[in-house]
């Protein structure tokens, strides 16, 4: 057979689906690898072929499209399971070809089991809600294309094991779940179960997402440098270790990059010929506000180092701030026998 452009195993598309539920999987060739869509390919006389390799096997085999009730079928560039079974887990390949052209890609499909509270090994999308911010909604994800718009499914929302109904600040509204006002107590896993009829059968789609309540943009402020500050003086003798912490508080801001850095005499520490190390630690509050601490450390400080300017800088989407540390050389305490005696005019 002629050469085939093999895009290998597309592990970026780690597809997970629930056991005993419908699943529609689009051939990734048209989404990520080729510059044309299925309709164009079909019009050009190209054929889409599907096959698979079972879990823990090496043998590629054709997909059986003659199962009872068309359990597995293909429609255009979509592979359908109505429904999935646990042993459908494996690597699936879609190949587009004619007599002169061939391109294929494989992707892993994992059929997972869920428990009575919708826990499973499935990776969950995270939806962030702002704390005490007014009405916000989450939408039941990835249900498009499963049933026509003429079909009116029933949607039930759960938090963990429990159905959400008549609750004062969380209201199920069909495909949406509205949070009239979000609190920390609303953190958790929310599941929508979509039930729809098809050809005399009833199917269920289960979709779970994690809600994380985060700091509101209403309360967001520019970075706040807690240390260094005007109340602390770093007084050292040459040869001692100099440790200066830079501690910065960042309000939560969606998609903001928080940065902290030191300058020494206006330059990056790497550009200064001294042995300096910087260690960073990060902690988060319950609403994902962030505190970053960068400790600047010079093991054996010289009198030259004690004359330098040490400035902590911080930046977020809300602004940039800087604060200099007060560093001094310790004045040695006078030795009584010589200095004080001389001072008192002793001969």
């Amino acid at each position: 057979s002629e050469r085939c452009d093999d895009w290998g195993l597309d592990t970026m598309r780690q597809i997970q689906v629930f056991e005993d539920e419908p699943a529609r999987i689009k051939c990734p060739l048209f989404e990520h690898f080729l510059k044309f869509n299925y309709s164009t390919a079909h019009s050009a006389g190209l054929t889409l072929i599907w096959y698979w390799t079972r879990q823990d096997r090496d043998l590629e085999e054709p997909i059986n499209f003659r199962l009872p009730e068309n359990r597995i079928s293909k429609e255009k560039d979509v592979l359908w399971f109505r429904p999935t079974l646990l042993n459908d887990t494996g690597n699936y390949t879609c190949m587009l070809r004619n007599t002169t052209y061939c391109s294929k890609v494989a992707f892993p499909l994992e059929v997972v089991q869920k428990d009575s509270c919708f826990n499973s090994p499935m990776k969950l999308p995270v939806h962030k809600l702002y704390i005490e911010y007014g009405i916000q909604r989450i939408t039941c994800p990835n249900v498009d294309g499963y049933f026509p718009s003429s079909v009116k499914p029933t949607i039930t929302w759960y938090m963990g094991c429990y159905k959400i109904q008549n609750f004062n600040n969380v209201i199920p509204e069909g495909m949406n779940l509205s949070f009239l006002i979000a609190f920390i107590s609303n953190n958790g896993n929310y599941t929508c179960v979509v039930t729809y009829p098809e050809n005399g059968r009833t199917f269920h789609l289960t979709r779970t997402l994690t809600v994380k309540v985060v700091g509101s943009p209403k309360n967001a402020v520019p970075p706040v440098i807690h240390s260094p500050n005007d109340h602390v003086v770093y007084e050292k003798e040459p040869g001692e270790e100099l440790l200066i912490p830079c501690t910065v508080y960042f309000s939560f801001l969606m998609d903001s990059r928080n940065e902290v850095w030191w300058t020494i005499d206006g330059k990056k520490p790497d550009d200064i010929p001294i042995d300096v190390t910087i260690n960073e630690s990060i902690s988060h509050s319950r609403t994902e506000d962030e505190t970053r601490t960068q400790i600047l450390s010079i093991k054996k400080v010289t009198s030259e180092d004690l004359k330098r300017s040490y400035v902590c800088h911080a930046r977020s989407a809300k602004g940039e701030v800087a604060k200099a540390a007060t560093v001094k050389q310790k004045v040695p305490a006078p030795r009584y026998t010589v200095e004080l005696a001389c001072g008192f005019g002793a001969t």
Epitope: S116, C117, N119, M159, I164
Partner: antibody, heavy 119, light 107 residues
Framework: QVQLVQSGAEVKKPGSSVKVSCKAS????????ISWVRQAPGQGLEWMGG????????NYAQKFQGRVTITADESTSTAYMELSSLRSEDTAVYYC????????????WGQGTLVTVSS | EIVLTQSPATLSLSPGERATLSCRAS??????LAWYQQKPGQAPRLLIY???NRATGIPARFSGSGSGTDFTLTISSLEPEDFAVYYC?????????FGQGTKVEIK
Amino acid sequence: QVQLVQSGAEVKKPGSSVKVSCKASGGTFSSYAISWVRQAPGQGLEWMGGISAIFGTANYAQKFQGRVTITADESTSTAYMELSSLRSEDTAVYYCARHLHNGIHLDYWGQGTLVTVSS
Amino acid sequence: EIVLTQSPATLSLSPGERATLSCRASQSVSNFLAWYQQKPGQAPRLLIYGASNRATGIPARFSGSGSGTDFTLTISSLEPEDFAVYYCQQGKHWPWTFGQGTKVEIK
């Protein structure tokens, strides 16, 4: 330290109802759910149902549906289990137990409440 | 509902010996299974969740294994305080159900 403290033992007549309380302390009540499990003398454990402390919605075992009502009062961090139309075979120790909203294992248990149904 | 069958009903062993308790489900429960210990006059105590994860404060001598329909609780070396009744519980399907228990008694 999480603690679930249940109400005291009860003696009831057949056909009557009993309401057992379970007060939680040492954790955020609204972050958890409370299940009720019973154990007849010398027998095993039987899950009756559970309630979400934040949403106040309950799940019940089919066997007890219509006869058991589980409620929660967030203001007092207390869950309640009411069993009606009592019969002698309902004589058992009734336990409340805590679990996460999406948890299927019961990590903290109350001390148990003995309910005796006798004419 | 899912029926959990524990075996043996009673296990007679001496301190220091290894105990192996079995729990079999009437259909697959994946790894959605927990084990509890109950001593006379006390409430049950969670030992293992997710078939193999030890709960907080549970000694390392307790371990769980299995997936699907067959599960095992192993106590590597019995201590005097381990003599009790052990229950398995599934959470794969409603209603949650328990096994009938295995009593571990001193020989």
